[in-house]
Interface confidence: low
Amino acid sequence: MRTEAQVPALQPPEPGLEGAMGHRTLVLPWVLLTLCVTAGTPEVWVQVRMEATELSSFTIRCGFLGSGSISLVTVSWGGPNGAGGTTLAVLHPERGIRQWAPARQARWETQSSISLILEGSGASSPCANTTFCCKFASFPEGSWEACGSLPPSSDPGLSAPPTPAPILRADLAGILGVSGVLLFGCVYLLHLLRRHKHRPAPRLQPSRTSPQAPRARAWAPSQASQAALHVPYATINTSCRPATLDTAHPHGGPSWWASLPTHAAHRPQGPAAWASTPIPARGSFVSVENGLYAQAGERPPHTGPGLTLFPDPRGPRAMEGPLGVR
């Protein structure tokens, strides 16, 4: 039996930010701002599952709902990567997969999703309120990150349905005729922002975590939307953290590690970027091993320190039969 929390990326900011302007005037503007900023942009979804048989075992699944080519996936816990989070695994389409304890198995699951199994006992063991984040670097969209965790009340012995939360799919929004509402909302939002400009700037309260708090949002959807939001990273407080950075980041490993892009959002056309036809190519056509977007990660030839491989002795799992998103 599993307890699941399916968390879409596009969520309003933390409720703690509501204190800035008050419920009545802030909720709608934030929703509209989220709509305005994210319309036509990709999404990242995160699903966290706790195995009932092993209470310290988690399965994290992340997917990218975008049209670009995935050039790197980073899974972290304790907050977003680069904002207090600790990296658990990095999946590179060409150079393979690297993971750190307590990650047990990271793999490409489909052409645009990955999964990571965590296990642990003792200091490095994850716990129910740990926040897990997945960051997808893609071309041409840039870097997208979403975070999720199990609901605080999760009972591993119960099979709970995924946490309901609306996903703002740009394509569906268009189909449902939200474009007009969006346009109106953006205009209305500008009007509200202008009104608030003339009031004294309120003090932002620290973000609070409550049972009602959304557990995920798009971290840094783009430089443009970051500039529009002007909201600093607000990581979810967790009482459960990795033991030490030393155990999570052993030294050594394959030489490609040093050459991985540190911030793919600012360099989506790096060596790990794939050009695709709908976007006018700037310069030469660039590709990395496999194309799937993303769709994949090659196994490095040798197992080095900190690098765990999971070869399938039967060959590609694709040969075994149908593979769907479980």
Partner: antibody, heavy 123, light 106 residues
Framework: QIQLVQSGPDLKKPGETVKISCKAS????????MSWVKQAPGRGLKWMGW????????TFPDDFKGRFAFSLETSASTAYLQINNLKNEDSATYFC????????????????WGTGTTVTVSS | ENVLTQSPAIMSASLGEKVTLSCRAS?????MYWYQQKSDASPKLWIY???NLAPGVPARFSGSGSGNSYSLTISSVEGEDAATYYC?????????FGGGTKLEIK
């Protein structure tokens, strides 16, 4: 059993358009990318590009930009290759090939190949 | 583009003989993939990640190499091995195939 079954042979005149189908079965169609490979008579294999079956985004190498188009009919688990303004040099056998994602570590190889469709362009 | 050159273009071998097919890349690649194609048939994945045999491939086949030079070896050729073998790289776009080596059995 995983299969990619392609449409039958086609005879076309220069300037016409041909559309080749590739019907997938035995797996979840939108899980794996689909590539297309050209093999001219007595010649080797040439990669024509691939389409992400989830997003529908196509990627082409320079040699196949312009007259070539990939499309999907997801509900029918079918991928299509369309070649416009056919030229004599388009006479070849065209294969669809599944991009083998989803293995333990993922990969970019072509793990399942279609039956092949021979297109003959002649005036 | 990364040009893959296979040699020899045609190879004739006797049953039980050890055979090595070569594939050289104009630029270094991380892994090489091999496909087998018999006449009037579709290609089949034969070796992936340089040295891993695809399901159903006999153990007499092996793959090796790194950088610019890769090879496919058959320890003891059998009649059913008569086919054309293509190498392929995914390291850089466009993904390219070698010209193929046609293996004939005497």
């Amino acid at each position: 059993q995983i299969q990619l079954v392609q449409s039958g042979p086609d005879l076309k005149k220069p300037g016409e358009t041909v559309k080749i189908s590739c019907k997938a079965s035995g797996y979840t169609f939108t899980t794996y990318g689909m590539s297309w490979v050209k093999q001219a008579p007595g010649r080797g294999l040439k990669w024509m590009g691939w389409i992400n079956t989830y997003s529908g985004v196509s990627t082409f190498p320079d040699d196949f930009k312009g007259r070539f188009a990939f499309s999907l009919e997801t509900s029918a688990s079918t991928a299509y290759l369309q070649i416009n303004n056919l030229k004599n040099e388009d006479s070849a056998t065209y294969f669809c090939a599944r991009l083998g994602m989803g293995s333990t570590t993922g990969a970019g190889y072509f793990d399942v190949w279609g039956t092949g469709t021979t297109v003959t362009v002649s005036s | 583009e990364n040009v893959l050159t296979q040699s020899p273009a045609i190879m004739s071998a006797s049953l039980g003989e050890k055979v090595t097919l070569s594939c050289r890349a104009s630029s270094s690649v991380n892994y090489m993939y091999w496909y087998q194609q018999k006449s009037d048939a579709s290609p089949k994945l034969w070796i992936y990640y340089t040295s891993n045999l695809a399901p159903g491939v006999p153990a007499r086949f092996s793959g090796s190499g790194s950088g610019n030079s890769y090879s496919l070896t058959i320890s003891s050729v059998e009649g059913e091995d008569a086919a054309t073998y293509y190498c392929q790289q995914f390291t850089s776009s466009p993904w390219t195939f070698g010209g193929g080596t046609k293996l004939e059995i005497k």
